[in-house]
């Protein structure tokens, strides 16, 4: 009688992560008596995947009824495949004994796993920056296989070119990660702007995956100040206004000083929003001229978003 052969008909099998993989194996004879075992890898470090005789293998099921006496099909199905399952699987026939001894191995089936990249996560700088400054954004996506992936950066739909991308690890791996850093120059009009990281991979049936960051979380637009004297409202009263224009974010505190002495402090509340997303605000101070013998120096002092105060002064002439 011809010697038993272990036949693994598939040289390679490719599976999507999350699916089940069927690994085929048949033997050509019922002799010698003894169990079948499945291993991943070869040599002393091989990993036992399934033992027909004993053990608990919750993700592995036999395709046919391997307990039947005449059974010669020892194909298995491995459920919920992840990239970590990739490798070469061997169907090995053992001869019954004490202990069982390895009799013959199949040629092996290479299991390749395709896995989608995770949704890209874009993160910006920890602190806000002002227009004309360059800030860095990072984009990360993980867990994909094969390694080939493309990553693009956009600002408001315009592709960016100043970025560096790494795919790790450099060598062979079950899955990969991508990390990219883009440099973006801020402008005063960027409150409504978005930075987008776009990742394309062979496993994606839809459009590329996108991660976004709103520049509103990154930018600080400092205000411009203008102090003006309004026409006299009453005989002894002058209305002085401080126009605080084009600032972002809204967090702003204004202090009026009369000849260096604090007169009033208020927080920006009823602001008006400009088309570009920045804010305007106006504060006014009613000055009683009759209380002053000399000219009055009025100062509008603004502390914006925790930054050092900026101020604008106005000299109020007191006529004798």
């Amino acid at each position: 009688e011809e010697e038993l052969q272990v036949i693994q008909p598939d040289k390679s099998v490719s599976v999507a992560a999350g699916e089940s993989a069927i690994l085929h194996c048949t033997v050509t004879s019922l002799i010698p008596v003894g169990p079948i075992q499945w291993f991943r890898g070869a040599g002393p470090a091989r990993e036992l995947i399934y033992n027909q005789k004993e053990g608990h293998f919750p993700r592995v099921t036999t395709v046919s009824e391997s307990t039947k006496r005449e059974n010669m099909d020892f194909s298995i199905s491995i459920s919920n495949i992840t990239p970590a399952d990739a490798g070469t699987y061997y169907c090995v026939k053992f001869r019954k004994g004490s202990p069982d001894t390895e009799f013959k191995s199949g040629a092996g089936t290479e299991l390749s796993v395709r896995a989608k990249p995770s949704a890209p996560v874009v993160s910006g700088p920890a602190a806000r920056a002002t227009p004309q400054h360059t800030v860095s954004f990072t984009c990360e996506s993980h867990g994909f296989s094969p390694r080939d992936i493309t990553l693009k950066w956009f600002k408001n739909g315009n592709e960016l070119s100043d970025f560096q991308t790494n795919v790790d690890p450099v060598g062979e791996s079950v899955s990969y990660s991508i990390h990219s850093t883009a440099k973006v120059v801020l402008t005063r009009e960027d409150v409504h702007s978005q930075v987008i990281c776009e990742v394309a991979h062979v496993t994606l049936q839809g459009d590329p995956l996108r991660g976004t960051a709103n520049l509103s979380e990154t930018i600080r637009v400092p205000p411009t100040l203008e102090v003006t004297q309004q026409p006299v409202r009453a005989e002894n009263q002058v209305n002085v206004t401080c126009q605080v224009r084009k600032f972002y974010p809204q967090r702003l505190q204004l202090t009026w000083l009369e000849n260096g002495n604090v007169s009033r402090t208020e927080t920006a509340s009823t602001v008006t929003e400009n088309k570009d997303g920045t804010y305007n605000w106006m504060s006014w101070l009613l000055v009683n001229v009759s209380a002053h013998r000399d000219d009055v120096k009025l100062t509008c002092q603004v502390e914006h978003d925790g930054q050092p105060a900026v101020s604008k002064s106005h000299d109020l002439k007191v006529s004798a």
Partner: antibody, heavy 116, light 109 residues
Framework: VQLVESGGRLGQPGTSLTLSCTVS????????MGWFRQAPGKGLEYIGI?????SPYYASWVNGRFTISKTSTTMDLKMNSPTTEDTATYFC?????????????WGPGTLVTVSS | DIQMTQSPSSLSASVGDRVTITCRAS??????LAWYQQKPGKAPKLLIY???FLYSGVPSRFSGSGSGTDFTLTISSLQPEDFATYYC???????????FGQGTKVEIK
């Protein structure tokens, strides 16, 4: 799982023509779909694809000559201003479940003849 | 755009022969290569994807190999139903575009 093309006929140069690919057994919202053509006695040529979310992508030579769109059960190919060089059998196909690098299901094709 | 060069453009062989068709890409496509069989008046049928993976239901006499720029389709023992035209098709992961080889017609000797 099945794809069937329709709309192939004898058309005049410059007169737009729309081909349809009707799918059954799966959802168009889950797969990338493609259009291909084959001139008589020639090889296969890629025209374009439409993503599962409905975004079309075209071969570099297309230059606005074709428009790909889809509804819930059909994918359309509009030939905007056909010439006699567009005479061919047009195939629709679905990409494989593992990725967009190959096409595992094809329709039987529909013949378009452009002639004056 | 990537060019795919298939050779030979045609070949004559007998039943039982071992047949090899090659496909060369003008730049690396890694393993993103598929092989199709087409018979006259019919749609293409997928044989091999990812350069070496046999599509389900395809006889094991078909095999594919290669990566980068050079690829091979092998029919280990030609059967009467294998007389057809064979096409290679690449996918480029950067341009996300597809290109076909010009085809190889396998005829009866």
């Amino acid at each position: 799982v099945q794809l069937v093309e329709s709309g192939g006929r004898l058309g005049q140069p410059g007169t737009s023509l729309t081909l349809s690919c009707t799918v059954s057994g799966f959802s168009l919202s889950s797969y990338v779909m493609g259009w291909f053509r084959q001139a008589p006695g020639k090889g296969l040529e890629y025209i374009g694809i439409i993503s599962s979310s409905g975004s079309p992508y075209y071969a570099s030579w297309v230059n606005g000559r074709f428009t790909i769109s889809k509804t819930s059960t059909t994918m359309d190919l509009k030939m905007n201003s056909p010439t006699t060089e567009d005479t061919a059998t047009y195939f629709c196909a679905r990409v494989g479940p593992l990725g967009v690098d190959y096409f595992n299901i094809w329709g039987p094709g529909t013949l378009v003849t452009v002639s004056s | 755009d990537i060019q795919m060069t298939q050779s030979p453009s045609s070949l004559s062989a007998s039943v039982g022969d071992r047949v090899t068709i090659t496909c060369r890409a003008s730049q690396s496509i890694n393993s993103y290569l598929a092989w199709y069989q087409q018979k006259p008046g019919k749609a293409p049928k997928l044989l091999i994807y990812s350069a070496s993976f046999l599509y389900s239901g395809v006889p094991s006499r078909f095999s594919g190999s290669g990566s980068g720029t050079d690829f091979t389709l092998t029919i280990s023992s030609l059967q009467p139903e294998d007389f057809a035209t064979y096409y290679c098709q690449s996918w480029h992961y950067i341009s996300r575009s597809y290109t076909f080889g010009q085809g190889t017609k396998v005829e009866i000797k």
